[in-house]
């Protein structure tokens, strides 16, 4: 039997991708391993090769179909296995019955753009990517703004408790460079987590007009 501690964590992006990370203390770096997906009620199965991301963890993406195709539903269960080559055979190292809509992590929001900017405020919009139509409007967002001289970790989180793909940032300083990020999370799923943060959007507020404040 395998010794050491192990963790096998996967998330579904709600459309056609399951991303997995497997960590195993004492595992050999040069061992060839893969994740195999075996749905309970579908004719396909899928495999991806685990690639090292650190000393003792590996990751891969199970591509189930075209990016916007709805490959799984709320009733699906996919048995996921980590298989590692041991001589001439494949050995099962980890196994889980994966309920995709209980383990959601969406893609980061995309297409961030400044809709309107003034001296003290800025209106920003974005789009969600590869999100299932099943969610309808059952999504929430978190946003953060990077101010000069601060880090992202210090930035206060702004929560949008509904599917609102825009925000109006207020009380900004005139003629100042900022960066903005947003992430998304479905309300559904016991183990659902936030998407990665979007790519930062840089913007600059307008300078205050001489003698008056806009």
């Amino acid at each position: 039997a395998v010794n050491g501690t192990s963790q096998f964590t996967c998330f579904y992006n709600s459309r056609a991708n399951i991303s997995c990370v497997w960590s195993q203390d004492g595992a050999l770096q040069d061992t060839s391993c893969q994740v195999h997906a075996w749905p309970d009620r579908r004719r396909w199965n899928q495999t991806c090769e685990l690639l090292p991301v650190s000393q003792a963890s590996w990751a891969c993406n199970l591509i189930l179909g075209a990016p916007d195709s709805q490959k799984l539903t709320t009733v699906d269960i996919v048995t996921l296995r980590v298989l590692c080559r041991e001589g001439v055979r494949w050995r099962v190292m980890a196994i889980q019955d994966f309920k995709p809509f209980e383990n959601l992590r969406l893609m980061a929001p995309i297409s961030l753009q400044v809709v309107h900017v003034e001296t003290h405020r800025c209106n920003i919009s974005w789009e969600i990517s590869q999100a299932s139509h099943y969610f309808e409007r059952h999504l929430e967002f978190e946003a953060r703004t990077l101010s000069p001289g601060h880090t992202w970790e210090e930035a206060p989180l702004l929560t949008l408790k509904q599917k609102q793909e825009w925000i109006c940032l207020e009380t900004l300083t005139p003629d100042t460079q900022y960066e903005f990020q947003v992430r998304v999370k479905p309300l559904q799923g016991e183990f659902t987590t936030w998407s990665p943060w979007s790519q930062p959007l840089a913007f600059r507020t307008k300078p205050a007009a001489l003698g008056k404040d806009t």
Epitope: A1, Q7, F8, D40, I77, A94
Partner: nanobody, 125 residues
Framework: QVQLVESGGGLVQPGGSLRLSCAIS????????IGWVRQAPGKQREGVSC????????YYADSVKGRFTISKDSAKNTVYLQMTSLKPEDTAVYYC??????????????????WGLGTQVTVSS
Amino acid sequence: QVQLVESGGGLVQPGGSLRLSCAISGGTLDSYGIGWVRQAPGKQREGVSCMSRSDDRTYYADSVKGRFTISKDSAKNTVYLQMTSLKPEDTAVYYCAAVDAYGCSLVQPTTYDFWGLGTQVTVSS
């Protein structure tokens, strides 16, 4: 080679209880993911309950949730399945199975490496 031996099956009336045991020899219980799988006459094998080796997390089929409980005694190298509020549809041969991996599966019983010979459970009045 790991060997699994089930016991505790029998005839019980609807609403009754049974406790199945699975004694493991040739290996350490804590080294395996363990599952209970049943097969009714003319039906496919169905995962009933399993216990993950990595963290002792337990899983149950919807049909038995709240009625069956899986547990283990590492000192005795034995896994148990406590079955309560039994129904006629629970009638089946119950197998203990083990997989040399982290985690376990209810959905795909064929992933198990080692199997016992089974114990018959009959629920009838």
